[in-house]
Interface confidence: medium
Amino acid sequence: EDELQVIQPEKSVSVAAGESATLRCAMTSLIPVGPIMWFRGAGAGRELIYNQKEGHFPRVTTVSELTKRNNLDFSISISNITPADAGTYYCVKFRKGSPDDVEFKSGAGTELSVRAKPSAPVVSGPAVRATPEHTVSFTCESHGFSPRDITLKWFKNGNELSDFQTNVDPAGDSVSYSIHSTARVVLTRGDVHSQVICEIAHITLQGDPLRGTANLSEAIRVPPTLEVTQQPMRAENQANVTCQVSNFYPRGLQLTWLENGNVSRTETASTLIENKDGTYNWMSWLLVNTCAHRDDVVLTCQVEHDGQQAVSKSYALEIS
Amino acid sequence: EDELQVIQPEKSVSVAAGESATLRCAMTSLIPVGPIMWFRGAGAGRELIYNQKEGHFPRVTTVSELTKRNNLDFSISISNITPADAGTYYCVKFRKGSPDDVEFKSGAGTELSVRAKPSAPVVSGPAVRATPEHTVSFTCESHGFSPRDITLKWFKNGNELSDFQTNVDPAGDSVSYSIHSTARVVLTRGDVHSQVICEIAHITLQGDPLRGTANLSEAIRVPPTLEVTQQPMRAENQANVTCQVSNFYPRGLQLTWLENGNVSRTETASTLIENKDGTYNWMSWLLVNTCAHRDDVVLTCQVEHDGQQAVSKSYALEIS
């Protein structure tokens, strides 16, 4: 009679995280008498996964095909697989012995690899706003994926970016991996409505990449342009001077009128007009009683935007 | 002889919270000898629900008498189900072993889903009042429902609204869910008696939706219109000037009379006339002793409504 052989038909098995892994094993004989055990790894440090006769292995079930009494199928199913379960699994036959059972024969091993999806990419922008023509950095992070191969792309409003640097950690073998990428984006005045997108492609995503987004509105400051003009007035002794504050973002704006360098009125912008590009406009006017002035008056419109240093524009009002 | 099979005939069972769940399980054989256990979930973290031989499981009763000699029915009933009981339940046969019993075969599992009613919707409005033609936001929240499918509609005085955004959390699997919706409502002058209704439909409600309401009277401020007129008087040396304050809401109103810019009298509106649309009217009058004035008098009616900036209307009283 031929000596018992342990057959592990699959060299490798790949399973998605959360699924069950079936590891197949068959014996060619019922003799010698003795238990079957499954181990992960070989040698002294191998880990017991399942013992046919004793122990408690709640994640392991024996494959429940309808088999006859003289069972030769010792396949197992391991439930709820995580990346930590990756490794080579051996089906081992023991022969009864005293005081301990003796290892008789081992299968060739089945390598279990675990496919784990990357987490949703998290995109974060700069801590402080920057103005157009400046460069800001955005980072994108995703974790927990396996295998290590992964592709990351950056887009701004659908246009692919090229100025970015990406790292996948750790460099060596691991149960799962993380990706970290930093993209450098040059701001333009029209970027209030712009968006940066970090796109991740991985074998587990079946061609349906994950995306993380960030709005440039959180990163940009568009400083206002000022224009001071005099409006025609019916009344001879009054002049109406307006200050047009244009194309600024974000909203926060405080305007101060000065007459010959002395503060005349301060107001905070409230009802703003929003432009198509997401920036805002605002207008303030000052009625000047010309009777109160003998000489020409210099009127200054001074604007403090988003906590930055004030900018101003002056207008010389001629007193005729 | 065919090997024992564990049959769980139902792939899934749906139960209303508070009811009992019956989980059916049958064996095809009495052999091998060993206990039956029920678990929720699979793998290392699975939870023991019932052990035929030992332990204390006060919520579990067996459907048939396990003591009957050739019993093959190991169905159980779990009382007082809550959303936390949702999950996949496995009926597992163990085989006697030494030192520990060995898991022999598991059923395919029965997924228990729990139908739990959403809590009464709570509708809350804006923190500060707004005036007609402005848009205000109302939120509606409801919690603790399962399954996740739910329908939320907004109405204003019976008319369905379309400008709202709804989220159901969490996005992934959970024992129960919450819904949060924000509706944007444009106020009109006639909205004091208006109501917004958040209506929630869910499978547990048998077509009888839950409703939460909020009154727009809590969200609206209708500013008054002022009209100052002189009433005829018999006495030659007295003039009666009235200030009609119309269509305001809410009640809080303070009126000040000024004569040539000097405060003459301040009063707080008390006995108001309520209009059909829920707004209020009030009238104040001022008796002016014309003898006390050589020149014409400018009478100003100045009204501060609901803590807002004062509005005023003036009347020039001619002293003949």
């Epitope: 408690h56 | 031989k53 030992e54 396990l66 003591t67």
Partner: antibody, heavy 113, light 108 residues
């Protein structure tokens, strides 16, 4: 109602044996594991072993292997604990319990010359 | 075998005081298989908490249990005189089943 009625107190001589009984009512012992637990005066609990009365299979703590023998008679719905070669160390209260949830009132065994 | 170590061995608490008893296992125990018993002098042990955190029938709500792996605890949110007793943790995760040495809880 589940009840476990244990036999009365025993005074035995060193070297002798004693057999304690635990009679169940309100359930059939065949459907549960029956455990025996030892408690010496003012001390902790020690698990001796258990029997599955359905087939007579037993498990013992190593300390009680050879000292204790657990048996069961399903016809009388009774579990037994036999202790042999008694010494003063065996003086204790012995409890039977059903599936870890219901306990008997205990039997005091005193070993004394 | 799994050794369960309970601490403290003896403790006293005032009425209204929060009390925590701990049970440490020499190796990991599945939470489904960790039970607590209460025993008063002259009485049999009573099942008090089963599967780590579930209160047995009749046990006051001021009791709670928690833990996982090798570390478990029983907590009384507000001590009462009737809670004075010995408490034993017990594992039946693997043979031989074992008990902790017990904590004797006294009222001040």
């Amino acid at each position: 109602e589940v009840q476990l009625q244990q036999s009365g107190a025993e005074l035995v001589k060193p070297g002798a044996s004693v057999k304690l009984s635990c009679t169940a009512s309100g359930f059939n012992i065949k459907d549960y594991y029956m455990h025996w637990v030892k408690q010496r005066t003012e001390q902790g609990l020690e698990w001796i072993g258990r029997i599955d009365p359905e087939d007579g299979e037993t498990k013992y703590a190593p300390k009680f292997q050879g000292k204790a023998t657990i048996t069961a008679d399903t016809s009388s719905n009774t579990a037994y604990l036999q202790l042999s070669s008694l010494t003063s160390e065996d003086t204790a209260v012995y409890y039977c319990d059903r599936g870890l949830a219901y306990w008997g009132q205990g039997t005091l065994v005193t070993v004394s010359a | 075998q799994i050794v369960l170590t309970q601490s403290p061995a003896i403790m006293s608490a005032s009425p209204g005081e929060k009390v925590t008893l701990t049970c440490s296992a020499s190796s990991s125990v599945s939470s489904s298989y960790l039970y607590w018993y209460q025993q008063k002098p002259g009485s049999s042990p009573k099942l008090w908490i089963y599967s780590t955190s579930n209160l047995a029938s009749g046990v006051p709500a001021r009791f709670s249990g928690s833990g996982s792996g090798t570390s478990y605890s029983l907590t009384i949110s507000s001590m009462e005189a009737e809670d004075a007793a010995s408490y034993f943790c017990h594992q039946w995760s693997s043979y031989p089943y074992t008990f902790g040495g017990g904590t004797k809880l006294e009222i001040k």
